[in-house]
């Protein structure tokens, strides 16, 4: 019955945030890339 | 992200009330909601909660006299079944498994002949 | 039903000095770490401060630190800061899929 319970941690969620802040760098990186070319 | 309580009101004692937590930002199909409530000038007290696949669980002094349920992805209802002037308090949605990482301001419920 | 049990209920220590709370579950929390505690203050929800056990929630000052295992903890809070006023509260989860809180400590700050 205890299995998978408390599955939404707060340190998952932090892994999240940090995964989502890291996307955001390199796709925010690569359109200021893109924007510079043109 | 966050997480906001809604529908507290004065009640009289046996009347139903519904109360809405409804979130932004994250959606309900990946996270836990907690039910907790506060008394005036008392402490915490945990209701129940309902998880991402929508397994419920609560306090054993809550069993009956609240239901929880998830409604949409991003709302989750408590009702308070036949509400005495005992469930006068404050109550939070909270966020979290474990632990309660995202609360609402909570809405006040007044139960009161 | 597990029980909390929080102490002191009240303590009082001047700026600069250092408060330590105790929290004794009744039974052992979930993976014996599944202990949070958490900062209050009048009118406001509380705030997480730490999680499991002891690691510390985001934008918490070190200041801040929780120890303990199983059915024992403890939160300290030093260099105390007029700010850190408040009620303090620890929670468990179990392995049932419930919760429980403690009675909560009030901090005041000379």
């Known amino acids: 019955h205890s299995d998978g319970i408390f599955t939404d941690s707060y340190s998952r969620y932090r892994k999240q945030m940090a995964v989502k802040k890291y996307l955001a760098a390199v796709l925010g990186k690569r359109y200021k890339q893109r924007v510079k070319n043109k | 992200q966050s997480v906001e309580a809604s529908g507290g009101h004065l009640v009289t004692p046996g009347t139903p009330l519904t109360l809405t937590c409804t979130v932004s930002?994250?959606?309900?199909?990946?996270?836990?909601m907690n039910w907790v409530r506060q008394a005036p000038g008392k402490g915490l007290e945990w209701i129940g909660s309902?998880?991402?696949?929508?397994?419920k669980y609560y306090a054993s002094w809550a069993k009956g006299r609240f239901t929880i349920s998830r409604t949409s992805s991003t709302t989750v209802n408590l009702k308070m079944t036949s509400p005495t002037t005992e469930d006068t308090a404050t109550y939070f949605c909270?966020?979290?498994?474990?632990?309660?990482?995202?609360w609402g301001q909570g809405t006040l419920v007044t139960v009161s002949s | 039903a597990q029980v909390l049990t929080q102490t002191p209920s009240s303590v009082s220590a001047a700026v600069g000095g250092t408060v330590t709370i105790n929290c004794q579950s009744s039974?052992?929390?979930?993976?014996?770490?599944?202990l949070s505690w958490y900062q209050q203050k009048p009118g406001q929800p509380p705030n997480l401060l730490i999680y499991?056990?002891?690691s510390l929630a985001s934008g918490v000052p070190s200041r801040f630190s929780g120890s303990g295992s199983g059915t024992q903890f403890t939160l300290t809070i030093s260099d105390l800061e007029c700010d850190d006023a408040a009620t303090y509260y620890c929670?468990?989860?179990?392995?049932?899929?419930?919760?429980?809180f403690g009675g909560g400590t009030e901090v005041v700050v000379k």
């Open positions: 909270a966020r979290g498994g474990g632990e309660f990482f995202i």
């Open positions: 930002g994250f959606s309900l199909s990946s996270a836990a």
């Open positions: 309902v998880d991402e696949r929508q397994n």
């Open positions: 039974q052992s929390v979930y993976s014996n770490n599944r």
């Open positions: 499991e056990a002891s």
């Open positions: 929670a468990g989860a179990y392995n049932t899929g419930i919760y429980g």
